[in-house]
């Protein structure tokens, strides 16, 4: 039975040209995480972290995607085209597969600064 839950960073925004960390966390289960896949909005694979084989970043994203922290993924040099959904897929034993969703909005620098100025501390 799958008792775990995936907690994600949810909906996040970041500045064009900046970087952002995509994080998922699996909780409420003792299952062993064997692999984590990170997919982009069009379901193309960005990266895989296999417990026994390590990280593999898809070559097309190599210059803009960094592994970590932890099982997360860091996207760098953000463009407006990076706006959209991102999915983490956790393969676990014995539970099976858990999936989490993050929505990233990339903002023009001036917009990001404007929205940040009015955030409640």
């Amino acid at each position: 039975m799958m008792t775990g839950t995936i907690e994600t960073t949810g909906n996040i925004s970041a500045k064009k040209g900046g970087s952002v960390i995509l994080q998922c966390h699996l909780s409420s289960t003792m299952a062993q995480v064997t692999q984590v896949n990170w997919e982009q909005h069009d379901h193309s694979l960005l990266a895989i972290r296999n417990a026994e084989l390590g990280w593999h970043i898809y070559p097309a994203f190599k210059d803009r995607v960094a592994p970590g922290p932890g099982l997360g993924l860091t996207l760098q040099s953000l463009t407006m085209n990076d706006t959209g959904e991102y999915f983490c897929t956790y393969h676990t034993y014995p539970d099976g597969t858990y999936r989490g969703r993050i929505f990233l909005e990339v903002l023009e620098s001036s917009v990001a600064e404007h929205s940040a100025r009015f955030q409640i501390p």
């Epitope: 692999q35 296999n50 026994e52 084989l53 390590g54 593999h56 070559p59 097309a60 393969h91 597969t97």
Partner: antibody
Framework: DVQLQESGPGLVKPSQSLSLTCTVT?????????WHWIRHFPGNILEWMGY???????IYSPSLKSRISITHDTSKNHFFLKLNSVTSEDTATYYC??????????WGAGTTVTVSS | DIQMTQSPASLSASVGETVTITCRVS??????LAWYQQKQGKSPQLLVY???TLAEGVPSRFSGSGSGTQFSLKINSLQPEDFGSYYC?????????FGAGTKLELK
């Protein structure tokens, strides 16, 4: 077009080290993908040996971990296999291959290595 | 290690026939299975990865299916260039392992 080519001695004496080079053309080994060694035994069995990543990290098959080393020379776009303490059971055709998410999309032609005194 | 059991070990067929090769895996590998073709004296060539995605340049008469522990490769309307050996390989954990192969021969 990416191409891989294995080279090295075809005959190695028992207890010595086997050293092979894979020359990669048409793609930089630091630009992504992993770079693997695989061998094909006379009995038609394929065995994955290990790989070096574009950043130089290595992962080895547990059964070979104690006697294998994979390194690279990024200036020459080469990567290397060194297998220590060989026996006749290491006689095989050795392939280098490019790996994407741990399957192999480009292979070298292979080089046959015989271990014999 | 994850064990890969391929069947049949050998198979005779004629041009135009349809054949299926199966690969049984000792534990759940989800969809992380690849298929290769190898001709005599040549290196293996990737046909399929992630169970059903055809590699670049592979004809559509090849198709992969399955999930978990049971997988198959189907070749429709066999062509003369399809004869040779076929291997499955999981791409899920260390060590990466291959099946023992299926030799497809001309009847």
């Amino acid at each position: 077009d990416v191409q891989l080519q294995e080279s090295g001695p075809g005959l190695v004496k028992p207890s010595q080290s086997l050293s092979l080079t894979c020359t990669v053309t048409g793609y930089s080994i630091t630009s992504g993908y992993d770079w693997h060694w695989i061998r094909h035994f006379p009995g038609n069995i394929l065995e994955w040996m290990g790989y070096i990543s574009d950043s130089g990290n290595t992962i080895y098959s547990p059964s070979l971990k104690s006697r294998i080393s994979i390194t690279h020379d990024t200036s020459k776009n080469h990567f290397f296999l060194k297998l220590n303490s060989v026996t006749s059971e290491d006689t095989a055709t050795y392939y280098c291959a490019r790996g994407s998410f741990w399957y192999f999309d480009v292979w070298g032609a292979g080089t046959t290595v015989t271990v014999s005194s | 290690d994850i064990q890969m059991t391929q069947s049949p070990a050998s198979l005779s067929a004629s041009v135009g026939e349809t054949v299926t090769i199966t690969c049984r895996v000792s534990e759940n590998i989800y969809s992380y299975l690849a298929w290769y073709q190898q001709k005599q004296g040549k290196s293996p060539q990737l046909l399929v990865y992630n169970t059903k995605t055809l590699a670049e340049g592979v004809p559509s008469r090849f198709s992969g299916s399955g999930s978990g522990t049971q997988f198959s490769l189907k070749i429709n309307s066999l062509q003369p260039e399809d004869f040779g050996s076929y291997y499955c390989q999981h791409h899920y954990g260390n060590p990466l392992t291959f099946g023992a192969g299926t030799k497809l021969e001309l009847k």
